[in-house]
Amino acid sequence: SGTTNTVAAYNLTWKSTNFKTILEWEPKPVNQVYTVQISTKSGDWKSKCFYTTDTECDLTDEIVKDVKQTYLARVFSYPAGNVESTGSAGEPLYENSPEFTPYLETNLGQPTIQSFEQVGTKVNVTVEDERTLVRRNNTFLSLRDVFGKDLIYTLYYWKSSSSGKKTAKTNTNEFLIDVDKGENYCFSVQAVIPSRTVNRKSTDSPVECMGQEKGEFREI
């Protein structure tokens, strides 16, 4: 049921990376507008993106209040210029989103290698601890703050002269690896949350190689 010429939203999809979370849907509106509501399973509905002609709504501010909660959103359709109009059942047409649990489902953003330092045959590689939009005590938390030891990084490293990639793992943001003296190495890191069943891995960081700016070499 619904108002004449008003169609319900469909393909409601959560797009979320490092907790920046946007709900997207179809169709592009023709003579209609949308309002989004979001709620936890036990909470009240909160309205966002009032009477918008967009087909997306940024819900980050709501989900970061508790990233371990499970959220549900719904998209209401209204005739343009007559938003008070309702469907035959006495309320606007709407469609529910899939459930979304940010802690378990937000995509891991591409990490960045902050620096690397060689001391003899050891190299220390540091991964940037990316800031999220999750807040605690008025401070933005880093990815490590949010995930703790649930978040690990896999380092792929290889001699510049070869292609085979060795791996190392850390549950901090630092790696200490052994390298061959006199060889240049390249590095790339991947964020992983092993306890997840979906969205477990990030895309790889940009590659950084020894002999470039980010590194420091000290002969001991």
């Epitope: 030891k149 060795k166 190392a168 793992k169 549950n171 991947q190 092993p194």
Partner: antibody, heavy 121, light 107 residues
């Protein structure tokens, strides 16, 4: 149910080639890491190489480097071991195994049934 | 590469015996050691990971421990189905390496 099924083994002459497949079901391979391990008759386990199907990263044991290539087709949820320039000492049962992490420690929780490769003239 | 030296290479024991197999890593591998059981003609099966964690579905008579670079697999009371070959493995660095195996036979 998680399962790995190898295929493609057989008898091949020295210098020949063979491609082994490792078909996964019950999970998607890009979320994990796939290793190949072999076991010569009456011998212990020897690691051959790995692939991260998510990004294509690979590494090989020195004994097979330059001759063997591991790849993955995520649309088929299958990993492959391409073996070229085969030698008698490559004769073994070849296993693929799924690797996962517990914290930073890796473990191989599911293995295929193995496929026998015999290199002989 | 890290060497995993496993001992003994074989042992004979009776049902009900306590069996201990050890592996020594040639350098620090932290807790990145797993133990596998293999029966003839079958693929290896994971028993222990992270040195001391019992894998799901594995009987509690199996346990693992670590002391520095020494790792131990213990079977508290050997059962008929435990006669098999056991391998330790380190995953701390690439390449991962296995011990030579310990064959547990019936006395």
């Amino acid at each position: 149910e998680v399962q790995l099924v190898e295929s493609g083994g057989g008898l091949v002459q020295p210098g020949g080639s063979l491609r082994l497949s490792c078909a996964a079901s019950g999970f998607t391979i890009p979320s994990y890491w796939i290793h190949w391990v072999r076991q010569a008759p009456g011998k212990g386990l020897e690691w051959v190489g790995y692939i991260d199907p998510y990004n294509g990263a690979t590494y090989y044991a020195d004994s097979v480097k330059g001759r063997f290539t591991i790849s993955a087709d995520t649309s088929k949820n299958t990993a492959y071991l391409q073996m070229n320039s085969l030698r008698a000492e490559d004769t073994a049962v070849y296993y693929c195994a799924r690797a996962d992490y517990h914290g930073v420690d890796e473990y191989w929780d599911y293995w295929g049934q193995g496929t026998l490769v015999t290199v002989s003239s | 590469d890290i060497q995993m030296t496993q001992s003994p290479s074989s042992l004979s024991a009776s049902v009900g015996d306590r069996v201990t197999i050890t592996c020594r890593a040639s350098q620090d591998v932290n807790t990145a050691v797993a133990w596998y059981q293999q029966k003839p003609g079958k693929a290896p099966k994971l028993l222990i990971y992270s040195a001391s964690f019992l894998y799901s579905g594995v009987p509690s008579r199996f346990s693992g421990s670590r002391s520095g670079t020494d790792f131990t697999l213990t079977i508290s009371s050997l059962q008929p189905e435990d006669f098999a070959t056991y391998y330790c493995q380190q995953h701390y660095t690439t390449p991962p390496t296995f011990g030579q195996g310990t064959k547990v036979e019936i006395k």
